[in-house]
């Protein structure tokens, strides 16, 4: 499933929105990492357009901010990308998923560096 700013022509929706999302997920990434967030819709069906919001501001897809169906990817993350992210139903602003993202200054260490 490719991410990017390409447009998706959407067909009819299968379901009406499901229940409210649970508590927010807390995620930590290293500087330079790609922040990847996934938010499958409740009930599994599309529910109209969605928007990713960071600290109250809607995110517009760009070369660094990639949006796919129910997915967000922020490339080459830095400390400024830390914050509260939510995936919302565009029409009602109903929160579908909630994430607390922290980007640490140090790059994340790979598994191959352990025990060397």
């Amino acid at each position: 499933e490719s991410l990017g700013t390409e447009q998706r022509v959407v067909g009819r929706a299968a379901e009406v929105p499901g229940p409210e999302p649970g508590q927010q997920e807390q995620l930590v990434f290293g500087s330079g990492d790609a922040v990847e967030l996934s938010c499958p819709p409740p009930g599994g069906g599309p529910m109209g357009p969605t928007v990713w919001v960071k600290d109250g501001t809607g995110l517009v897809p760009s070369e660094r901010v990639l949006v796919g169906p129910q997915r967000l990817q922020v490339l080459n993350a830095s400390h400024e990308d830390s914050g509260a992210y939510s995936c919302r139903q565009r029409l009602t602003q109903r929160v579908l998923c909630h994430f607390s993202v922290r980007v640490t200054d140090a790059p994340s260490s790979g598994d191959d560096e352990d025990g060397e």
């Epitope: 109209g48 357009p49 969605t50 928007v51 517009v60 897809p61 919302r88 565009r90 029409l91």
Partner: antibody, heavy 121, light 110 residues
Framework: EVQLLESGGGLVQPGGSLRLSCAAS????????MSWVRQAPGKGLEWVSG????????YYADSVKGRFTISRDNSKNTLYLQMNSLRAEDTAVYYC??????????????WGQGTLVTVSS | QSVLTQPPSASGTPGQRVTISCSGS????????VSWYQQLPGTAPKLLIY???KRPSGVPDRFSGSKSGTSASLAISGLRSEDEADYYC???????????FGGGTKLTVL
């Protein structure tokens, strides 16, 4: 001041094509969702298509699906509607409408003045 | 026939309060917000109410919106002659994956 200026309307024969443009100014065009809404003479409003910035999705009314294509050029602050295989029932004033901020509830908060499309032989 | 049902006409005298209804279903009004638009003769529509009951800046508080279940209403109090216009309700419809408008209500100020 937000301004939306439609152009490209006119008289076209059934089966023909037309491309409408909507030049936007007074706001950060790329950050806003946009729609086309039409109104046949003496009739009510009908939503035609919408293009959504937040997830890149595009939606169409059943009546135009497969015939009309919505697109945008953010570098030119312009919204387009490519209309193919036009029918008499597509005759209407076509309005370009701007949605509210992405982090607020959806609504058409600004409208252009409209451009008339007449499909007739 | 429109997905959202509005009375074709309504009327009132200056100073009166009039209400315009908009009836839908669970796939639109029942699970989504309603917005209302005013269209004066020969002009483009203008946003009056969004998110069921919110008023954009510049819209007089004589205009108010409400919703219950799958129906919504627009109320205009202190009716004025300049309120004579067509009024449309709108909502997203999940089963159609698109916006739907009511057929419109022509308001006459007697």
């Amino acid at each position: 001041e937000v301004q939306l200026l439609e152009s490209g309307g006119g008289l076209v024969q059934p089966g023909g094509s037309l491309r409408l443009s909507c030049a936007a100014s007074g706001f950060t065009f790329s950050s806003y969702d946009m729609s086309w809404v039409r109104q046949a003479p003496g009739k009510g409003l009908e939503w035609v298509s919408g293009i959504y910035s937040g997830d890149g999705s595009i939606y169409y009314a059943d009546s135009v699906k497969g015939r009309f294509t919505i697109s945008r050029d953010n570098s030119k602050n312009t919204l387009y509607l490519q209309m193919n295989s036009l029918r008499a029932e597509d005759t209407a004033v076509y309005y370009c409408a701007k949605d509210g901020p992405m982090n607020e509830e959806s609504r058409f908060d600004y409208w252009g003045q409209g451009t008339l499309v007449t499909v007739s032989s | 026939q429109s997905v959202l049902t509005q009375p074709p006409s309504a009327s009132g005298t200056p100073g009166q309060r009039v209400t315009i209804s908009c009836s839908g279903s669970s796939s639109n009004i029942g699970n989504n917000y309603v917005s209302w638009y005013q269209q004066l003769p020969g002009t483009a529509p203008k946003l009056l109410i969004y998110a069921d009951s919110k008023r954009p800046s510049g819209v007089p508080d004589r205009f108010s919106g409400s919703k219950s279940g799958t129906s919504a209403s627009l109320a205009i109090s202190g009716l004025r002659s300049e309120d004579e216009a067509d009024y449309y309700c709108a909502s997203w419809d999940y089963s159609l994956s698109g916006y739907v408008f009511g057929g419109g209500t022509k308001l006459t100020v007697l």
